[in-house]
Amino acid sequence: KESCDVQLYIKRQSYHSIFAGDPFKLECPVKYCAHRPQVTWCKLNGTTCVKLEGRHTSWKQEKNLSFFILHFEPVLPSDNGSYRCSANFLSAIIESHSTTLYVTDVKSASERPSKDEMASRPWLLYS
């Protein structure tokens, strides 16, 4: 029997290699049954996850899944870091795994490196 718990489908240790100046949508896939939970995004600062207030977010509905989207318009170098989404469901908080944005500033890279290069060459990235 299908679980009716809220589930957040962000993979552990997932990452996105992106470029400053580009638009980017960070998606939090949410599975729920009857009532859509309240979902928020936060950004990790050490062990604390700081809630992102006043940011452009939206919902996208697909067949079996809803997506709570955090919009970056555009991506800034300071957006580099790890993010987590959380759902408030029946007064319990369900947290996703964190996902990391690796932001490359195109001004400091003569040409755009590949995703794998970026993940394996941390000196290209902001910390």
């Epitope: 589930q7 957040l8 489908y9 962000i10 993979k11 552990r12 240790q13 997932s14 990452y15 996105h16 290699s17 990790l44 062990t47 947290e95 795994h97 964190s98 995703k115 794998d116 993940a119």
Partner: antibody
């Protein structure tokens, strides 16, 4: 039913490349990480790297960086591991393993592919 | 890299008796999400590995309840309450908290 079916045994010359495939079924490959692990004759297990079929992102052990290429074709639910510049020490059984990425709910292994590097 | 050290490397056991395998990591396997990503694998002779235990103590479906995992931080144990003939093989601990993921050397369980 869940299956990870790997390609057959290969005999390769030193300096050449080999590409091993891993056809998955019974689950959505996008929900998993595909790992490649090898086992030299009579030895233990050695992690080569990991691919996220949902977006192509890949991580490698330093030892294999630049020599191994791990990919996945979501449309055919098949993962691949290519190893170049082969040497005799690369003789091993190569395994693919599929681990669910969200809640660790499953971890399945392929049957293994023996790659023999010999002149 | 995280070094995983198993002991003993060879474990002769009488059928029906308990068995215990230790695995120590060179650094803590506690991830920042509060979970510890330590797996135990079984490799029977001539077969591919099979996941028995994940997240230190969770048993995979189909794994007999005579297998149990415990531990935290850097110290982990796999216990078999009563060894059966089908348990013969090599057991590996595997951490997937830190890149690169690493395995223990393996413990060969055989029947006395």
């Amino acid at each position: 039913q869940v299956q990870l079916v790997q390609s057959g045994a290969e005999v390769k010359k030193p300096g050449s490349s080999v590409k091993v495939s891993c056809k998955t079924s019974g689950f959505n490959i996008k929900d998993t990480y595909i790992h490649w692990v090898r086992q030299a004759p009579g030895q233990g297990l050695e992690w080569i790297g990991r691919n996220d079929p949902a977006n192509g992102n890949t991580k490698y052990a330093q030892k294999f960086q630049g020599r191994a290429t791990i990919t996945a074709d979501e449309s055919t639910s098949t993962a691949y591991m290519e190893l170049s510049s082969l040497r005799s020490e690369d003789t091993a059984v190569y395994y693919c393993a599929s681990y669910e990425g969200y809640y660790e709910r499953f971890g399945y292994w392929g049957q293994g592919t023996l790659v023999t590097v010999s002149s | 890299d995280v070094v995983m050290t198993q002991s003993p490397l060879s474990l002769p056991v009488t059928l029906g008796q308990p068995a215990s395998i230790s695995c120590r990591s060179s650094q803590s396997l506690l991830d920042r999400d509060g979970k510890t990503y330590l797996n135990w694998l079984q490799q029977r002779p001539g077969q591919s590995p099979r996941r028995l235990i994940y997240l230190v103590s969770k048993r995979d479906s189909g794994v007999p309840d005579r297998f149990s995992g415990s531990g935290s931080g850097t110290d982990f144990t796999l216990k078999i309450s009563r060894v059966e003939a089908e348990d013969v093989g090599v057991y590996y601990c595997w951490q997937d908290t830190h890149f690169p993921y690493t395995f223990g050397q393996g413990t060969k369980l055989e029947i006395k």
